[in-house]
């Protein structure tokens, strides 16, 4: 099975400067900002069927590195 | 589910100033990368900047002098000028956002083609 | 800029059979543990539609029959069984840095 895609939430990156838990790496800017900016990815309600409009991250990828997900190395800034 | 919907003149005269709007609904402005793209009638794709969620810019280099990107978030709309048009701005103008963490562009308008002619 | 040169140009592949096609980038797109590496489906008069994301991943809705491989500077878009609705332009794209950058597409028949 495919290994699914990585998260760059706070919770996975290690030290030395990680995002705290409520903020996610923004690749552009290159520092931590609130996750609600970003527009991560909303889980699904419970028993929806059709897939969410959004192709980020599956609901339980959206949280962290969950089971057969990689957490994603985030050093310092550059 | 999030829409966006470009609209602007389709014809423009050489020297004039390009200007669209993009309209978004389904989701805030306030969040995300909000580009714009363009695709040339050889099917050449220019990426061409982008506003944040912050209202910062970024216009790829080659276009810089010539592009401005605004946005009025009581609207929920963003902006596209390109001054000093030339026939070579002929394209088809998508507004586009993309995914987190990928930034992969999943959400496109449909797209407004725009002649630059006298 | 990355440069991202697509091949072949154009390709015709017969119904069932496997279509591939390239993009080489002219620096690495892999950042994080991520490849920063997009494909598009464009069609006549429609907005590319992204097909996979960060090299390897399904877009939403895509079927099962495309699928991307590749890390660094060397990717792939395969295609199979190839089917009637498959005909149309591909793209790829880095968004690994600003200015994100597109190949220059590559054409895809039925033979």
């Known amino acids: 099975m495919r290994r699914g895609p990585r998260s760059l939430r706070g919770r996975d990156a290690p030290a030395p400067t990680p995002c705290v838990p409520a903020e996610c790496f923004d690749l552009l800017v290159r520092h931590c900002v609130a996750c609600g900016l970003l527009r991560t990815p909303r889980p699904k309600p419970a028993g929806a069927s059709s897939p969410a409009p959004r192709t980020a991250l599956q609901p339980q990828e959206s949280v962290g590195a969950g089971a057969g997900e990689a957490a994603l190395p985030l050093p310092g800034l550059l | 589910e999030v829409q966006l919907q470009e609209s602007g003149p389709s014809l423009v005269k050489p020297s004039q100033t390009l200007s669209l709007t993009c309209s978004v609904t389904?989701?805030?402005?306030?969040?995300?990368?909000w580009n714009w793209i363009r695709k040339f009638p050889g099917n050449k794709l220019e990426y061409m900047g982008y506003?944040?969620?912050?209202?910062?810019?970024y216009y790829n280099p080659s276009l810089k002098s010539r592009i401005s990107i605004t946005r009025d978030t009581s609207k929920n709309q963003y902006y596209l000028q390109l001054n000093s048009v030339t026939p070579e701005d002929t394209a088809t103008y998508y507004c586009?956002?993309?995914?987190?963490?990928?930034?992969?562009?999943?959400?496109w308008g449909q797209g407004t083609s725009v002649t630059v002619s006298s | 800029d990355i440069v991202l040169t697509q091949s072949p140009a154009s390709l015709a592949v017969s119904l069932g059979q496997r279509a591939t096609i390239s993009c080489r980038a002219s620096?690495?797109?892999?950042?994080?543990?991520?490849?920063?590496m997009n494909w598009f489906q464009q069609k006549p008069g429609q907005p590319p539609k992204l097909l996979i994301y960060?090299?390897?991943n399904q877009g939403s809705g895509v079927p099962a029959r495309f699928s991307g491989s590749g890390s660094g500077t060397d990717f792939s878009l395969n295609i199979h069984p190839m089917e009637e609705d498959d005909t149309a332009m591909y793209f790829c794209?880095?968004?690994?840095?600003?200015?994100?950058?597109f190949g220059g597409g590559t054409k895809l028949e039925i033979k």
């Open positions: 506003i944040s969620y912050s209202g910062s810019t």
């Open positions: 960060a090299a390897s």
């Open positions: 586009a956002s993309p995914n987190y963490p990928f930034y992969a562009m999943d959400y």
């Open positions: 620096e690495s797109v892999d950042n994080y543990g991520i490849s920063f």
């Open positions: 389904g989701d805030s402005i306030t969040s995300g990368y």
């Open positions: 794209q880095q968004s690994k840095e600003v200015p994100w950058t």
